[in-house]
């Protein structure tokens, strides 16, 4: 019997499909300061990949990175150059639980302050078999990390 | 460099049991899943298994549920595989192989040749 | 299980020509979260262990020459070779890793003639 590792029951929408969605919604309430979003966004370079190591229990060898995964910043007109937190924001909340690191709880933190938008949250569950459960943390850590660290080069 | 290490050769009695190991180096071993696969002489591949090194987390072929065993020594850094009641069919070489879970199979031993033979 | 088929089993040819070799998956390989196909081509020599090419379906692994390119989405995939050496005399492997058991092509052998 195959197990779906790749199933999308827990993965309503595609990460590159989320920005768009969300982002065409009502405007932010408060718009944070350029330096404000730049102080965050170099936090979350550093928490992230504090974060990845912590998983991989601090395995510093070269990762394998495919530069089309989806972007994490978004390109809208009212917040430029800002992480797209609302794509973001659902699925570190989906693994948060799993890691039980206060990184992670701060990094939500975080992406919650980059949040300007009143847009329904998108519902990600995690997935139940643990082979998936792992593939799937460690998917969305290394794309967000990755993510971030191609933006600062 | 990452290197995993097999036994070149192992040969035992039908009935018997074998257990082969695979040493890592070069990496972190928990940060990897362990992959076990069978070549047959003159055939093609058979994925056996995998083992989570951090946890000991196991996942079986169904058909080598009752023939293997998989198992994990941290301390060593050697991933084990157990194989019971052999015969002929069971000779073969079996690679270990690292898995990063995201992407793939990336590092293969060189194969341990097992011959059952009386 | 998904099962991995693979075409043709063997094929010779020149060096200097091309090569191209299918392998389909009888289910979808495309992990929705990466939008990445886990689909893996191993090449393997007489008498070696197995060794990476390509992962992602097209992603090709480090220090793999150029002339390999993997290419295909879903459930059909295909490597090709632009310009087959001598040194490329082997049997070549797709195995997904959607889906346990991960499964393996039967393989393709190239012969050089």
């Known amino acids: 019997m195959v197990s779906h590792i790749g199933s999308t029951r827990f993965a309503l929408f595609l990460l590159c499909c989320l920005g768009t969605l969300m982002f065409s919604h009502t405007g932010p309430i408060y718009q944070l300061q350029p330096k404000e979003i730049q102080a965050i966004i170099v936090e979350l370079q550093n928490l992230s990949k504090k974060l990845l190591d912590d998983y991989l229990n601090k395995e510093k060898g070269v990762q394998k990175f495919d530069s089309d995964l989806p972007s994490c910043f978004t390109s809208d007109s009212q917040a430029p150059g800002n992480i797209n937190s609302s794509a973001i924001l659902p699925y570190f909340k989906a693994i948060s639980p799993s890691l039980n690191n206060d990184k992670s709880l701060y990094i939500i933190e975080q992406l919650d302050k980059l949040n300007f938008q009143n847009a329904p949250e998108t519902e990600v569950s995690m997935p139940t078999d643990n082979f998936e459960r792992k593939r799937f943390i460690l998917t969305i850590l290394r794309w967000f990390s990755n993510c971030l660290e191609h933006r600062a080069q | 460099q990452v290197q995993l290490q097999q036994p070149g050769a192992e040969l035992v009695r039908p009935g018997a049991s074998v257990k082969l190991s695979c040493k890592a180096y070069?990496?972190?071993?928990?940060?990897?899943?362990m992959n076990w696969v069978k070549q047959r002489p003159g055939q093609g591949l058979e994925w056996i298994g995998m083992i989570d090194p951090s946890d000991s987390e196991t996942h079986y072929n169904q058909i080598f549920r009752d023939k293997a065993t998989l198992t994990i020594d941290k301390s060593s850094s050697t991933a084990y595989m157990q194989l019971s009641s052999l015969t002929s069919e069971d000779s073969a070489v079996y690679f270990c192989?690292?898995?990063?879970?995201?992407?793939?199979?990336?590092?293969w031993g060189q194969g341990t040749t097992l011959t059952v033979s009386s | 299980d998904i099962v991995m088929s693979q075409s043709p089993s063997s094929l010779a040819v020149s060096v200097g020509e091309k090569v191209t070799m299918s392998c389909k998956s009888s289910q979808s390989l495309l992990y929705s979260i990466n939008q990445k196909n886990f689909l893996a081509w191993y090449q393997q020599k007489p008498g070696q262990s197995p060794k990476l090419l390509i992962y992602?379906?097209?992603t090709r692994e480090s220090g793999v020459p150029d002339r390999f390119t993997g290419s295909g989405s879903g459930t059909d995939f295909t490597l090709t070779i632009s310009s087959v050496k001598s040194e490329d005399l082997a049997v070549y492997y797709c195995q997904q890793h959607y889906g346990y058991p991960f499964t393996f092509g039967s393989g393709t052998k190239l012969e050089i003639k």
């Open positions: 992602w379906a097209s």
């Open positions: 070069g990496y972190t071993f928990t940060s990897y899943w």
């Open positions: 192989a690292r898995q990063d879970i995201v992407t793939t199979v990336d590092y």
